[in-house]
Amino acid sequence: LNTTILTPNGNEDATTDFFLTSMPTDSLSVSTLPLPEVQCFVFNVEYMNCTWNSSSEPQPTNLTLHYWYKNSDNDKVQKCSHYLFSEEITSGCQLQKKEIHLYQTFVVQLQDPREPRRQATQMLKLQNLVIPWAPENLTLRKLSESQLELNWNNRFLNHCLEHLVQYRTDWDHSWTEQSVDYRHKFSLPSVDGQKRYTFRVRSRFNPLCGSAQHWSEWSHPIHWGSNSSKENPFLFALEAEQKLISEEDLGGEQKLISEEDLHHHHHH
């Protein structure tokens, strides 16, 4: 087999002989195909999915995953015991709660068993990769004639989370956003009784217990107020969106992460 490596512009090339089964140990000129990047997400500190894009392999390859924790009591190399598959090819590994140690450096190694020297190691801070479940049990209560309070629950993580509340009326083009700290409640001081309000919340593992960038999925929306403005076109759009959300959530397991956030990296 003859493999050639080009520079990124595709114009210059240098050819080397490259054997998938027996790579020469004394040759530094051989360039091995890079392994795909592993992306890990810890879901509500209940389980973790570490996934990779198996489609980037030029031939079907069941890559294997090993992991350990650096400089800790858990530094023994572990084999993946629960692989995730895409078209019968390994594309991820699921680790259970007992295997997750948020505050130790997680080392993950991907390897090509057909060519053991083809391997890549990454170090990850798991506390920055936590994605909580969507907030639940949204409730609204009237504090005064014009003031509303929104409350919600998060499963398990509570004080570790910050939140983002979005609300809009049936006359609004876009959402109004408000950041909320770990206290999972939000007050709207001035409510127009003639309008219908929709609220939703998402949460993030930040900043008290970690520095995660990814938000949870949005909660189910909750509504407050008048239903009288049916002639308003924005209301119809809003209701159609709500219907879509409801239908999605009825079907099977709740999707954890929006597709634009995670692309293909989230597996169930």
């Epitope: 003859n2 490596i5 520079t7 990124p8 980037s56």
Partner: antibody, heavy 122, light 108 residues
Amino acid sequence: QVQLQQSGPGLVKPSQTLSLTCDISGDSVSSNIATWNWIRQSPSRGLEWLGRTYYRSKWYKDYAVSVKSRITINPDTSKNQFSLQVNSVTPEDTAVYYCARMTGPRYYFEYWGQGTLVTVSS
Amino acid sequence: DIQMTQSPSSLSASVGDRVTITCRASQSISSYLNWYQQKPGKAPKLLIYAASSLQSGVPSRFSGSGSGTDFTLTISSLQPEDFATYYCQQSYSTPPITFGQGTRLEIK
């Protein structure tokens, strides 16, 4: 919808160089899941895979042993195409040449060029 | 390299017949076996991928089975448009990608 459009001469003299180009639409030659292949077909050899190029943070090429000393496959990112060159051709290289795309994780040729009959003759 | 051997190399059949073409790999290729149909002057067309999955738009009279080294393509009831040449192809261990030598299906 991916389409592959081949171009190049249909007649090449012995000992000269065969050159074909495959224009890609609906995908990028720099895709990180595709491989871009050349295949030829003749009555004596059947369907014969010649080689491929693919981008995975840099460019890679694989060639069939039977032609590796004479073949070059090059991507051209600016034109979103890839090309085939076969040097020192003989009448044995007379065949219909196809370009084709393969992608994971299923690894089949779903998209093919229309084919170019190349005759090697003086 | 993995060699792919198809049999028969040609066969004659009538419209409505059930036809089976076999493909054998020189070593195990799991289920990484694809079947193509080719008509004169045209590029091969994918029929079956991953040994048994029907490509979108392909009539259900085509089916594939097998894994490891032995595979079959079956046409349950031949139609006039099915008379063509059929090829198997492995993508388990590449490069090289290898094809069977083809089975020519003719009208009896």
